[in-house]
Structures are given as C-alpha cells and as structure tokens.
C-alpha cells in the first residue's frame, strides 16, 4: 500500500546537470531503509509515454546517469523515481522539467599558463561535453553557446587586477616585472543564460631577466 | 586562405521567396559559427541569423523570425538562407561571414537581394 | 536586446589629424567590443577587438580604449585611404548590434 506522503520513502528528486552531464539523484525519506530499491523513468515534454531506464531499475543506488536520455539540448525533460521498501510500500515523485540549457552549471576551463619574462601567456582548451554531433565528434560549449566568454583575470598585487576577456582562447598580460609569482583566474561565462563557472587558478612566476646577468 | 562567395540574390516580389547560399573554403567549414548580416541602402549592419555548423544551434533577428531558415550542407563547405514572406524592408546587400578563432573576421563579398512590387 | 548609440555620425579630417569615434553600450558587453572599417561597395574589415586590441595587419595608428560601458577608436593621424565608414559591433550577446556607424572625410 502507499504510504500517506511519498516523502516517508522518497524526498529531493532532482537532476544536477553539469557541462551537460545529466545525473538524476534523491534521497530516502525518514522511513527509507538501505534494501529500499529504486527504479527509474524518464520522458519528453509533451509525451506521454513513461521510459523505463535500463540500469536504473530496482536499483539501491540514488543516482541514475541520464545524459543519453536527456541529450537532446532543444527538448524539456521529465523523470520520476519509484522507490519500493522491503514491505513493499512504494512511492513515486517527479521532477520539474528540466532544460539541460539552462540548468546546467558549468566547470571551471581547462587552461594552459606560459610564463615569459614580462607576459603570462593563457590558452583555454575547449571543454568536451558529452554530447554528439550528427558527425559523431562530441561537441563543446563553445559550439552550443554562441555567446560564451572568456574572463581572465591577473592579481598584480593586493590592489590591482589586470583583465581580459573575449571568444578567443588565446590571450597574454603583457607589461609584468620579471621574476614575479601572479595569480590568474579563468571563468567561462555565459551571459544569455546567466551561467558563470568556478575558476580555474593558476599560481605563475614570470621568468627571471638573464640579459643583464 | 579563406573565402566566403554568396550567391542567389536578386529581385523578387513581395511576398516571395529567394535562397542565398554561401560558398566557403580555406577552414574547418563543420565546425563553425557561420552568420548571415545585411545592409539596406544606405544603411548601417544587422545580423540576421547565425548557425552552428557542429551542433546545428541557430539564432535569429527578432524581425526576421518566421520568415527565413539558416542552415548548412556540411559536405559541400555550403551556408544557406531560406527567405519566405519577403518585405520590401528586406531589400538589402546580404553578407556572409564566419567566427575563426574567437573573431568575426572574414567576410564574403555580398549579394543584392531587393524586393519590390 | 543591447543597443550600440554611436557619434558622431559623419566627421571631416585633414591628413594627418587625430580623430576619435565613440560607441556607448546600453548595458554591460565587458570588453566584447570590435571596430570595423568598412570602404564603399566592400565588406566591412576588422580593425580592433575585445576593445583595445588590434587586428594583425592594421596600422598602429588605430588604437582602441574602453571605459565602462563607454568605447573609443582612435585613428592617430588620419591618411587618405582612412576615408570609410566605422562601425563598433558588440560581441558579447544574440543579436549581435552595431552601431549606426561614422562616415569619416577627408577635407
């Protein structure tokens, strides 16, 4: 029979979807026990049918990877979890709908920092997400967001920054004494969609000057 | 070295249709933010519409919405613009151009596209 | 969507006079902000990106600066082939806008 609240068994069903990696999770209610088991279903807006997820079914695990099922970035998304205890009470609960574009939250760039001897060269590697082109190759978030920026930033000293920021992937502060450690960070921001990363860090030493020694 | 040539411009009633393509070379055509921009006579650039060659994602003008359809043929190196619904506000030299390394930075040469009664 | 107000809208130079072009952003684009060079009967070409940064193959007499959401192009010493039309674009989000643009004469 079915508890009074699905919440005894079941609470927080949510997907946490990150550079487009699409994890649904939950927890166990207060009446949750650890042979509870959990099966999976997912669909599309505007569907009617429920898919059962092969390999989310009676499972005792509160995660399901639904990055495949979920990878179309133009559609809306549902998904629900059944839990069934030992004593055979069971309970279900649904998701909001989701958007991968817009609920995912994105992971610090990948960066390469060169130093010189009065610049710190910054390359921004594209970050792979784990979606497919018709052509097979994984696209990056650079192909999905047409407006995605690079924000750089060098820590000079404790009162002063320098920037730089753009599309490109290549960029270098110039005008910086030699022989010098600076701090960079790197975020991708994208402002359509008010998405902003974690940054990535760099701790650099510019290169000692060798032509006056 | 690269090149974008546009063609398929020319006069059409309003109302009709016309399809503008662009042929590109000298980069990696399938992996590319591909746009179409015009000019009126005598006017100042508006983008019109943009496309991902990889992903397929595409954007377009408030005022143009509706009306045409951005796509490509990735094995032919081919951009296209399908205009519907034509407007003689429409009357325009169409350009097309692409992102390389961060910058809109290389351009074709332009076709007239103008719509008249 | 971010409007780009440009001005002036036309200016006449002599040779060798300093000139500048401003574009004032109605919201923040950072420093996602391009100038263009665009000749009759052409298309536009690149001068300056992400604000202050020149295009390689474009004399140093062009220079970019941003103060806010406030942009400038600067040409140092204008020369006859500067007659044109300059255009700043802002790149920093769907529609991309340019501003209305600057028809520069040579006296």
């Known amino acids: 029979h079915a508890p009074e609240d699905p919440s005894d068994l079941l609470q927080h069903v949510k997907f946490q979807s990150s550079n487009f990696e699409n994890i649904l999770t939950w927890d166990s209610g207060p009446e949750g026990t650890p042979d509870t088991v959990y099966s999976i279903e997912y669909k599309t807006y505007g569907e009617r049918d429920w898919v059962a997820k092969k390999g989310c079914q009676r499972i005792t695990r509160k995660s399901c990877n639904l990055t495949v099922e979920t990878g179309n970035l133009t559609e809306l998304y549902y998904a629900r979890v059944t839990a069934v205890s030992a004593g055979g009470r069971s309970a279900t609960k649904m998701t909001d709908r989701f958007s991968s574009l817009q609920h995912t939250t994105l992971k610090p760039p990948d960066v390469t920092c060169i130093s010189k001897v009065r610049s710190i060269q910054m390359i921004v590697h594209p970050t792979p997400t784990p979606i497919r082109a018709g052509d097979g190759h994984r696209l990056t978030l650079e192909d999905i967001f047409h407006d995605l920026f690079y924000h750089l930033e060098l820590q000079v000293n404790r009162t002063y920054q320098m920037h730089l920021g753009g599309k490109q992937r290549e960029y270098e502060f110039f005008g910086l004494t030699p022989d010098t450690e600076f701090l960079g960070t790197i975020m991708i921001c994208v402002p359509t969609w008010a998405k902003e990363s974690a940054p990535y860090m760099c701790r650099v030493k510019t290169l000692p000057d060798r032509t006056w020694t | 070295e690269v090149q974008l040539v546009e063609s398929g411009g020319g006069l059409v009633q309003p109302g009709g249709s016309l399809r503008l393509s662009c042929a590109a070379s000298g980069f990696t055509f399938s992996s590319s933010w591909m746009y179409w921009v015009r000019q009126a006579p005598g006017k100042g650039l508006e983008f019109v519409s943009v496309i991902n060659t990889r992903s397929g994602i595409t954007h377009y003008v408030e005022s143009v919405k509706g009306r045409f359809t951005i796509s490509t043929d990735n094995a032919k190196n081919t951009l296209f613009l399908q205009m519907n619904s034509l407007k003689s506000e429409d009357t325009a030299v169409y350009y097309c151009?692409?992102?390389?390394?961060?910058?809109?930075?290389?351009w074709g040469q332009g076709t007239q596209v103008t719509v008249s009664s | 969507d971010i409007v780009m107000t440009q001005s002036p809208s036309s200016l006449s130079a002599s040779l060798g006079d300093r000139v500048t072009v401003t574009c004032q952003a109605s919201q923040s684009i950072r420093s996602s902000l391009n100038w263009y060079q665009q000749k009759p009967g052409q298309a536009p070409k690149l001068l300056i990106y992400?604000?202050?940064r020149l295009r390689i193959g474009v004399p140093s007499r062009f220079s970019g600066s941003a103060s806010g959401t406030s942009f400038t192009l600067t040409i140092s010493g204008v020369e006859s082939e500067d007659l044109a039309t300059y255009y700043c674009l802002q790149d920093y989000t769907w529609p991309l806008s340019f501003g209305s643009g600057t028809r520069l004469e040579i006296k």
């Open positions: 151009a692409t992102r390389i390394q961060g910058l809109i930075d290389y």
């Open positions: 992400g604000a202050s």
